[in-house]
Interface confidence: low
């Protein structure tokens, strides 16, 4: 175990050095965490290049919302959002949309400020078709069950341990070398009973737990 721990620690140190050399470095985020921490989660299409808002630190993208997955309470009966606002500078975590395909649908998890949708380079924002079927289902239905109750706890260095029974250890970075791993793609951290959260499989059956994913506290 020691050689693996040493190797993993070395890799993580290197990654942290690379990340810290950039002005805007984003912590890896499990999709469930992104869902729960966002005011708004929508599916939308980007309609063109960003428009700089004169004399401000913001720019905005025109979007066409196709579906709202979270935020009904915050928005009330608003019909949708025409713009996504982001800092105008990449060094302030401004989001840069690279796809030119206006018909491509994106999942956007953002924050609501002043009645506007705000996104940054750290926002969970991915093409909808890039999500696994299990993730798509979870964004529509399942992740919400864990919000405010369960916490995805990132394991970024070995050893790591749970701090609470409401936490689920997220080990994708250690075991898979990426935040886009098996737990991200196929599992959600959900309440098993009022005092305990566990990883639950996002497949047909919601009862199968991820083996060894929850270590002793």
């Amino acid at each position: 175990m020691a050689p693996f721990a040493s190797l993993a620690s070395g890799i993580l140190l290197l990654l942290s050095l690379i990340a810290s050399s950039k002005a805007c470095s984003c912590a890896p985020t499990h999709p469930q965490t992104a869902f729960c921490n966002s005011d708004l989660v929508i599916r939308a299409k980007f309609m063109g290049s960003p428009e700089i808002i004169e004399t401000t630190l913001y720019q905005r993208y025109e979007i066409k919302m196709t579906k709202m997955l979270k935020g009904f309470d915050a928005v009330g009966n608003a019909t949708g959002f025409r713009f996504a606002y982001t800092p105008a500078m990449e060094s302030l975590c401004g989001y840069v949309h690279k796809s030119q395909n206006r018909s491509e649908e994106f999942l956007i998890a953002g924050r609501l400020r002043n009645g506007n949708l705000h996104i940054t380079a750290c926002s969970f924002l991915v093409p909808w078709h890039n999500l696994s079927p299990a993730q798509q289902k979870a964004f529509v239905k399942t992740y919400s069950a864990g919000c405010g109750v369960c916490t995805v706890f990132p394991c970024s260095a070995i050893p790591c341990k749970l701090e609470s029974d409401s936490h689920c250890l997220w080990t994708d970075q250690i075991l898979m070398g990426s935040e886009k791993g098996y737990q991200s793609d196929h599992f959600a951290c959900l309440p098993r009973n009022p005092d305990l959260c566990t990883w639950q499989y996002l497949g047909v059956s919601m009862t199968r737990s991820l083996p060894l994913a929850k270590a002793e506290a």
Epitope: S21, K22, A23, C24, S25, C26, I53, T55, T56, L57, Y58, P87, A88, M89, E90, S91, L92, C93, R113, N114, G115, T120, C122
Partner: antibody
Framework: QVQLVESGGGLVQPGGSLRLSCAAS????????MSWVRQAPGKGLEWVSA????????YYADSVKGRFTISRDNSKNTLYLQMNSLRAEDTAVYYC???????????WGQGTLVTVSS | DIELTQPPSVSVAPGQTARISCSGD??????ASWYQQKPGQAPVLVIY???DRPSGIPERFSGSNSGNTATLTISGTQAEDEADYYC?????????FGGGTKLTVL
């Protein structure tokens, strides 16, 4: 570690000019937006100007627009503030500060005093 | 432009909780940051994005922001927390600082 050191302050007559510099070290300067904030003696903080990491975008408070110019030389890791048509109300300690992620100013220099007086 | 109003002074006994308010029109719809400044020193960022704490800032510092008021809370206030505190927010017209609050630890 991150260090910001301002210089160029001093006594200048009303209508005069001054150029402040801020030498940065300990981080990848060109990746960070930077800002100038001032504080008049015994008063609070006032945001003055900001510039993007590349230097391509600049922003100014209304009180200095048209008189002050912010710039940077990424090859020298240095931020500048060119101040023209100075007024008595520009008297202040001028701080150079770095933007962290989003809009918090996470590192500040110790400041340089600019006194505008006849 | 948004105007931010802070009380000029707040006093607290050591070990007690200090709360410093910052009010502005619909401030809760914007992000607020807080800075600590001790005499003769540069400001230090203690809270950003309403409630996030930079690394190195003690856990006793916390922030909240809703409605028209952002609040900096210092739990278990210590003598070393005596300083001036400034709130800062931004509208689409850049940054605005509050007038500052002098925190006195009795």
């Amino acid at each position: 570690q991150v260090q910001l050191v301002e210089s160029g302050g001093g006594l200048v007559q009303p209508g005069g000019s001054l150029r402040l510099s801020c030498a940065a070290s300990g981080f990848t300067f060109s990746s960070y937006a930077m800002s100038w904030v001032r504080q008049a003696p015994g008063k609070g903080l006032e945001w003055v100007s900001a510039i993007s990491g590349s230097g391509g975008s600049t922003y100014y408070a209304d009180s200095v627009k048209g008189r002050f110019t912010i710039s940077r030389d990424n090859s020298k890791n240095t931020l500048y503030l060119q101040m023209n048509s100075l007024r008595a109300e520009d008297t202040a300690v001028y701080y150079c500060a770095r933007y962290g992620a989003y809009f918090g100013l996470d590192y500040w220099g110790q400041g340089t005093l600019v006194t505008v007086s006849s | 432009d948004i105007e931010l109003t802070q009380p000029p002074s707040v006093s607290v006994a050591p070990g007690q909780t200090a709360r410093i308010s910052c009010s502005g029109d619909a401030l809760g719809d914007k992000y607020a940051s807080w800075y600590q400044q001790k005499p003769g020193q540069a400001p230090v960022l203690v809270i950003y994005d309403d409630s996030d704490r930079p690394s190195g800032i003690p856990e006793r510092f916390s922030g909240s922001n809703s409605g028209n008021t952002a609040t900096l809370t210092i739990s278990g206030t210590q003598a070393e927390d005596e300083a001036d505190y400034y709130c800062q927010s931004y509208d689409f017209n850049f940054h605005v600082f509050g007038g500052g609050t002098k925190l006195t630890v009795l």
